[in-house]
């Protein structure tokens, strides 16, 4: 609550986070034309990525282009790309949605349709679907531990999110334990009424606010984070603006002196841990 | 402007960032002591990194030290490095100019000069210029999408620069479309008053501004971002301050069970994404 | 110092990072089944990794894991995790602590302990201490050159502090030199009361306090800023919340047609960079 | 039906070398550590050597140094090389695998062995 007669200062905070978890993926795989169930273990230096700062990530999908290898080829036949003769097509030409540099000539890309050739990472990344249930579906069982220090260096003040008397097996309850910092990322969804399942195909940025409203005066010293959740992307945004989350990276590799790269779309989830609040003294 | 009767309440900001774009690059290659033409294609997954946060990097230069080993080699002779005896060679010195430790001899680095030699990864990194011009120049024709959700918690209330109305093919422009929020990223520097293709040379740190000065009483509600740009690092900064901006990256791979790297030398444009502003309310 | 008259507002801070330095590695390696002294050396590409934003780590230790595959295998004997019949394996079951998904066998792990079998990236990682003392000690002597540029947009004032009088070889010292923005890392942590040899061992976190307190009256004009160190990680902290800084990553690579992975337990030093401050003005 | 089906072995003098291979057919999702058992006549089943699909090998303390043994993941076959053959090496030689027919549904399998026979 506001004290008028209190001096206020911003949060000074620093964040680091750890994911546990595994998840169990299966998928079709194809070798040598043939195709088979494919069935691995994702841990987390398989899904995660070493972040600073306070935001970290999480997979839950991924397309794999694998093999590509800089060449010509046609592009993909997405809509509005076919072509019929090279008049179609522009040398020195590169669509921003296209992932190469046209040649100029107009070349079948299967039996039934003809694109304009570019000089690219080939075969040209296909634009198909997130896979759909998720293939990281159960990262919902997943769980973060958030560890928070803040500072306020005007009150000479510091403090943090874990305390000594803390249990380490606790898992965050908004009732019946909300000093807890592991969370479920299941239960992050939930209490920000999102549905994981359903996210987890196109990915999302969610955000966990941790709000420090500190008095630090020692009458009536308090000084507890707050955790809430709120989605920060925009589920209903129009195709144009590229819905929910997603990044490209590629891994490089020679075979035969030629390089060669599996170029992997991967989707998930960013959270984003914003860290607000006031320290007020006398 | 300052509506004193007001409660004013710093911004809380979450930033999502999209690039888009391919470059041709053209450069000679060396194989088998053989220099030709190379010619390679760059899409967002060779040129760009996943990254968090309020940051994005697109590399816009390179300089390549392929199949380096751990091993002994003579160290560059860059200014004051050669020597002409082992008595100029000191065993166990790590120099911070130099990239390894001194053996205590002095060998020849080339048929005219002889250096210390050094414990590295080798051969060691020559210390040549970035290429000129910029062999990503082309970054210049990319675009950035640039998503951000705010918070005022206080006022409880949540809004992002992206509105329903707003067409995703739009580019901004500061007087025709100052609320379209993909960014072509020469148009950035034009309006920070740079030169995009001196810049990309050795790589520098643009800022993208977001002010939100939020008006949220009911009878006079406004509340959408103003963008600017301005150039972070310093253009005039003295050698020894590493003007510029460049990171060193490594790609490992074994062959003949030796483990080697392809060291890269990434000079980019790292932009950073600033979202300030207040919400005020009666 | 308050001066109740002034307009305050606070800083808008962007920090550009460059670590300098080698390490000399020296570390037991075992290769068919020989153990050997190997020695390697480390430079920025090898101990740090390209970060935006206001962060940089530092890689002070490790565990490798080579060679692991996606296969079945014993899972590593931790307390509590060993077996002596197939009862007290389930199939299907994820142990949090464990690495895999069992598949209800009890198998042998070594001639001398049986537990349950698992299909994870095989063999497991050994739950083992990181090296004692850390293999990149010698870190301590790296330096760290800090770039802040700085803005009041409400006062239209930027500013930085790298000035261009300074001296791109000074060191930083609190009473010799506060101005010089070249760190040694070693030096932070004795600022901080810290042991750089004893954090380098599981890692910690870092705070770099960069403290603005800007008058930007013209008459009494004054703006640089103030460097202090505090280390943010709880070095007291119970072993079930993780002490210490480090993550997991990985090197994936193909040999015999099947897909391999190095995975690496990275310790080390983050480094956060903290920025706050306010210009005033009447 | 999985089968592994083991070829080479014979007669050979002491001091001699043959290769031993074990290939596995049928319909199943991975194979995973293969291996090579030897029973001499009047004695247990013991190990020879074994590997896992990340070619990572262990040999018995008799054998080492003399016999190794690898893999083909594309052909899921297992080799064994024996040099410096010994009298006391003679022994019927089985392969084993365990392959795992669905996701996590593995099954040790056998195969029906093969002759080592050295004279001195």
């Known amino acids: 609550s506001d004290k008028l007669y209190q001096r206020k200062e911003p949060v000074i905070s620093s964040v680091h986070t750890k994911v546990k978890g595994i998840a169990e993926v299966t998928e079709n795989v194809t070798e040598g034309g043939v195709t088979k169930l494919g069935h691995s273990i994702f841990d987390t230096a398989d899904y995660t990525f070493p972040l600073q700062g306070n935001s970290f990530f999480v997979m839950t999908n991924y397309v794999k282009s694998e093999g590509q290898v800089q060449t010509l080829c046609p592009e993909y036949p997405r809509r509005g790309a076919q072509c019929s003769s090279d008049r179609r097509c522009k040398k020195g030409w590169m669509d921003p949605q296209s992932k190469g540099i046209q040649t100029g000539r107009c070349v079948p890309y299967d039996k039934t349709r003809k694109t304009c050739e570019v000089s690219a990472w080939c075969p040209t990344e296909e634009e198909k679907e997130a896979p759909r249930p998720a293939l990281l579906r159960s990262a919902e069982n997943f769980t973060v531990l958030i560890k928070n220090n803040i500072h306020f260096p005007g009150h000479n003040y510091t403090t943090r999110n874990i305390l000594p008397t803390m249990n380490g097996s606790c898992t965050f309850h908004k009732t019946w334990d909300p000093q807890c910092s592991i969370f479920r990322l299941g239960d992050i969804f939930q209490e920000a009424g999102e549905n994981f399942t359903e996210v987890a195909v196109q990915g999302g940025i969610m955000g966990i606010e941790i709000y420090w409203d500190c008095n630090l005066d020692s009458w009536s010293h308090h000084c507890r984070p707050r955790y809430s959740f709120r989605r920060l992307d925009d589920k209903n945004m129009d195709e144009s603006f590229v819905p929910g989350y997603n990044f490209r990276y590629a891994k490089y590799y020679k075979e035969n002196n030629v390089e060669k790269r599996t170029l992997i779309k991967a989707f998930g989830i960013r959270f984003d841990i914003l860290v607000f609040g006031t320290g007020g003294k006398f | 402007s300052d509506k004193l009767y007001q409660r004013k309440e710093p911004v809380i900001s979450s930033v999502h960032t999209k690039v888009k774009g391919i470059a041709e690059v053209t450069e000679n290659v060396t194989e088998g002591g053989v220099t030709k033409l190379g010619h390679s294609i760059f899409d967002t997954a060779d040129y760009t990194f996943p990254l968090q946060g309020n940051s994005f990097f697109v590399m816009t230069n390179y300089v390549k030290s392929e199949g380096q080993v751990q091993t002994l080699c003579p160290e560059y002779p860059r200014r004051g490095a050669q020597c002409s005896s082992d008595r100029r060679c000191k065993k166990g010195w790590m120099d911070p100019q130099s990239k390894g430790i001194q053996t205590g001899r002095c060998v020849p680095y080339d048929k005219t000069r002889k250096t210390c030699e050094v414990s590295a990864w080798c051969p060691t990194e020559e210390e040549k210029e970035a290429p000129r011009p910029a062999l990503l120049r082309s970054a210049e024709n990319f675009t950035v999408l640039i998503k951000n959700n705010i918070h005022f918690p206080g006022h409880n209330y949540t809004t992002r620069n992206i509105l329903p109305t707003m067409n995703g093919s739009c580019t901004f422009h500061k007087t025709w479309d100052p609320q379209c929020s993909i960014f072509r990223l020469g148009d950035i520097f034009q309006e920070a008053g740079e030169n995009f293709t001196e810049v990309a040379v050795q790589g520098g740190i643009m800022g993208i501004e977001i002010y939100w000065d939020c008006n949220l009483d009911s009878w006079s509600h406004h509340c959408r971002p103003r963008y600017s740009f301005r150039r972070l690092d310093d253009k005039n900064m003295d050698e020894s301050f590493v003007p510029g901006y460049n990171f060193r990256y490594a790609k490992y791979y074994k062959e003949n069970n030796v483990e080697k790297r392809t060291l890269i030398k990434a000079f980019g444009i790292r932009f950073d994404i600033l979202v300030f502003g207040t919400g005020g309310k009666f | 110092s308050d001066k109740l008259y002034q307009r305050k507002e606070p800083v808008i801070s962007s920090v550009h990072t460059k670590v300098k330095g080698i390490a000399e590695v020296t570390e037991n390696v075992t290769e068919g089944g020989v153990t050997k002294l190997g020695h390697s050396i480390f430079d920025t590409a090898d101990y740090t990794f390209p970060l935006q934003g206001n962060s940089f780590f530092v890689m002070t230790n490790y565990v490798k894991s080579e060679g692991q595959v996606q296969t079945l295998c014993p899972e590593y004997p931790r307390r509590g995790a060993q077996c002596s019949s197939d009862r007290r394996c389930k199939k299907g079951w994820m142990d949090p602590q464990s690495k895999g998904i069992q598949t209800g066998r009890c198998v042998p792990y070594d001639k001398t302990r049986k537990t349950c079998e698992v299909s994870a990236w095989c063999p497991t990682e050994e739950e083992k201490e990181a090296p004692r003392p850390a293999l990149l000690r010698s870190a301590e002597n790296f330096t760290v050159l800090i770039k802040n540029n700085i803005h009041f947009p409400g006062h239209n004032y930027t500013t930085r502090n790298i000035l261009p009088t300074m001296n791109g070889s000074c060191t930083f010292h609190k009473t010799w030199d506060p101005q010089c923005s070249i760190f040694r890392l070693g030096d932070i942590f004795q600022e901080a009361g810290e042991n750089f040899t004893e954090v380098a061992v599981q890692g910690g976190i870092m705070g770099i306090e960069i403290y603005w307190d800007c008058n930007l009256d013209s008459w009494s004009h004054h703006c640089r800023p103030r460097y202090s160190f505090r280390r943010l990680d709880d070095k007291n902290m119970d072993e079930s919340f993780v002490p210490g800084y480090n993550f997991r990553y990985a090197k994936y690579y193909k040999e015999n047609n099947v897909e391999k992975r190095t995975l690496i337990k990275a310790f080390g030093i983050r480094f956060d960079i903290l920025v706050f401050g306010t210009g005033g003005k009447f | 039906e999985v089968q592994l089906v083991e070829s080479g072995g014979g007669l050979v003098q002491a001091g001699g070398s043959l290769g031993l291979s074990c290939a596995a057919s049928?319909?199943?999702?991975?194979?995973?550590?293969m291996a090579w058992y030897r029973q001499a006549p009047g004695k247990q089943r013991e190990l020879v050597a074994d590997?896992?699909?990340?070619?990572?090998?262990n040999y018995a303390d008799t054998v080492n140094g003399r016999f190794t043994i690898s893999r083909d993941n594309v052909r899921n076959t297992v080799y064994l090389q024996m040099n410096g053959l010994k009298p006391e090496d003679t022994a019927a030689y089985y392969c084993?695998?365990?392959?795992?027919?669905?996701?996590?549904?593995?099954?040790?399998?056998w195969g029906q062995g093969t002759q080592v026979t050295v004279s001195s």
């Open positions: 084993y695998a365990r392959i795992e027919l669905g996701v996590l549904e593995p099954r040790d399998y």
């Open positions: 049928g319909n199943f999702f991975r194979v995973n550590t």
């Open positions: 590997i896992t699909r990340g070619d990572r090998t």
